[in-house]
C-alpha cells in the first residue's frame, strides 16, 4: 500500500516582501526520502526543479531556491511540490512574493532565465546532504 504523502510547506527568507534588487530564498520542506522538489510559479506550467535536497531535521528534507536579484517580474504566487518515489505530492499552500521599490537602491540587473535559482547554505552540518534525481515530468519553464 502506498503511503499518503504529506503536503509540503513553503517559506521565504528573509521574508515575503523583498526590495528590488535584493535576494530571496524559497524554502520547500517535505518528508524524509524526497527525490525532487519543485517550485511552481503562479501555475503548474512554470517551475524549477532541484534534486539537491538536504536533510533538514530528523523527520524532514528540504530544498532551497534562491533568486539573487529580485525584479518586479518575480512578484507573484509560489508553491512547492515534491516527488517521493513512486509519486508526486500535493502542492503546498501558495506564498505570495511582493517586490517593493528600494529607495536609492541599484537598478535590478536583467538575468537569464533560470540563472539565479538555487538554495543557499544552511549552517547545520546535517543539512548538507543531497538527494538523487527523480524522473522529471513536464519540460520546465524556468521561474527566474
Amino acid at each position: 500500500q502506498e503511503e499518503d504523502l504529506p503536503r509540503p510547506s513553503i517559506s521565504a527568507e528573509p521574508g515575503t516582501v523583498i526590495p528590488l534588487g535584493s535576494h530571496v530564498t524559497f524554502v520547500c520542506r517535505g518528508p524524509v526520502g524526497v527525490q525532487t522538489f519543485r517550485l511552481e510559479r503562479d501555475s503548474r506550467s512554470t517551475y524549477n526543479d532541484t534534486e539537491d535536497v538536504s536533510q533538514a531535521s530528523p523527520s524532514e528534507s528540504e530544498a532551497r531556491f534562491r533568486i539573487d536579484s529580485v525584479r518586479e517580474g518575480n512578484a507573484g504566487l509560489y508553491r512547492c511540490i515534491y516527488y517521493k518515489p513512486p509519486k508526486w505530492s500535493e502542492q503546498s499552500d501558495y506564498l505570495e512574493l511582493l517586490v517593493k521599490e528600494s529607495s536609492g537602491g541599484p537598478d535590478s540587473p536583467d538575468t537569464e532565465p533560470g540563472s539565479s535559482a538555487g538554495p543557499t547554505q544552511r549552517p547545520s552540518d546535517n543539512s548538507h546532504n543531497e538527494h538523487a534525481p527523480a524522473s522529471q515530468g513536464l519540460k520546465a519553464e524556468h521561474l527566474y
Epitope: P58, F65, A117, Q121, N126, N129, E130
Partner: antibody, heavy 119, light 107 residues
Framework: EVQLVESGGGLVQPGGSLKLSCAAS????????MYWVRQAPGKGLEWVAR??????????YYAASVKGRFTISRDDSKNTLYLQMNSLKTEDTAVYYC??????????WGQGTLVTVSS | DIQMTQSPSSLSASLGDRVTITCKAS??????LAWYQQKPGKAPRLLIS???SLETGVPSRFSGSGSGTDYTFTISSLQPEDIATYYC?????????FGGGTRLEIK
Amino acid sequence: EVQLVESGGGLVQPGGSLKLSCAASGFTFNTNAMYWVRQAPGKGLEWVARIRSKSSNYATYYAASVKGRFTISRDDSKNTLYLQMNSLKTEDTAVYYCVRGGSGFFAYWGQGTLVTVSS
Amino acid sequence: DIQMTQSPSSLSASLGDRVTITCKASEDIYIRLAWYQQKPGKAPRLLISTATSLETGVPSRFSGSGSGTDYTFTISSLQPEDIATYYCQQYWSTPYTFGGGTRLEIK
C-alpha cells in the same frame, strides 16, 4: 541512460598532482549534487568529496583525509565533474569513482579510474 | 564522525538461505541509511535508501529495516547472483561513512 565516465587516473609519484575528470550524460547534471568516492585495493569504500549544484552555490565538502589537498569542481556547461589532487600520498592509491548523488547516498556510479601513488 | 559497525565481516550461506547483515551507527542516523552491493571488479550498486526503500529494478528478495542506530539488511532466499560484498552507509551527516563491508560466499 545515466552514464558517468571517469578519466585521468594513472601512476604518479608521492607529492605529485593529478586531475580526474568525469563526463556525465543521461540526466540533468546541473541540478544534481556530485561526489567522488574511492576504494583502496582490497579495502572498503570511502567518501572523498562532494559538490552541490548551482542552486546551493556550488558548496563543497571534503573528507578529513583529503581536505586541503584535493579540490572538487564542476563545469555545468560541459556536464563534467573534476577532482584536482595535489600533494598525493601513497595512501591515496585507490580506484576513484564519480557518483551522481542522492541526499547523501550514492545512486549512480561510474566505472572508476585507478590512481596509483608510488615511487 | 559517525562510525558504522557492520557485521559479520564475512559469511558463508547456502543457496536458498535467508541471509541477514547488521549495521550499527555510533549515533542516531534517523533512517538515513543506504545499502550497496559490489561484485569483484565492478562499481557498487545502490540497493536500498532511507533504510527500507528498494531502488527500482532491485529484486524483492532484498529488504532493509531498522531505525535509530540499528539497521538490518536481509536477503530472503540467497541466489547465485547475490554473491558479492555488501556495504551500509549513513548519510545523516558529513562525513558520510560506510560500514566495513560483508563478504558473502556460497557454502
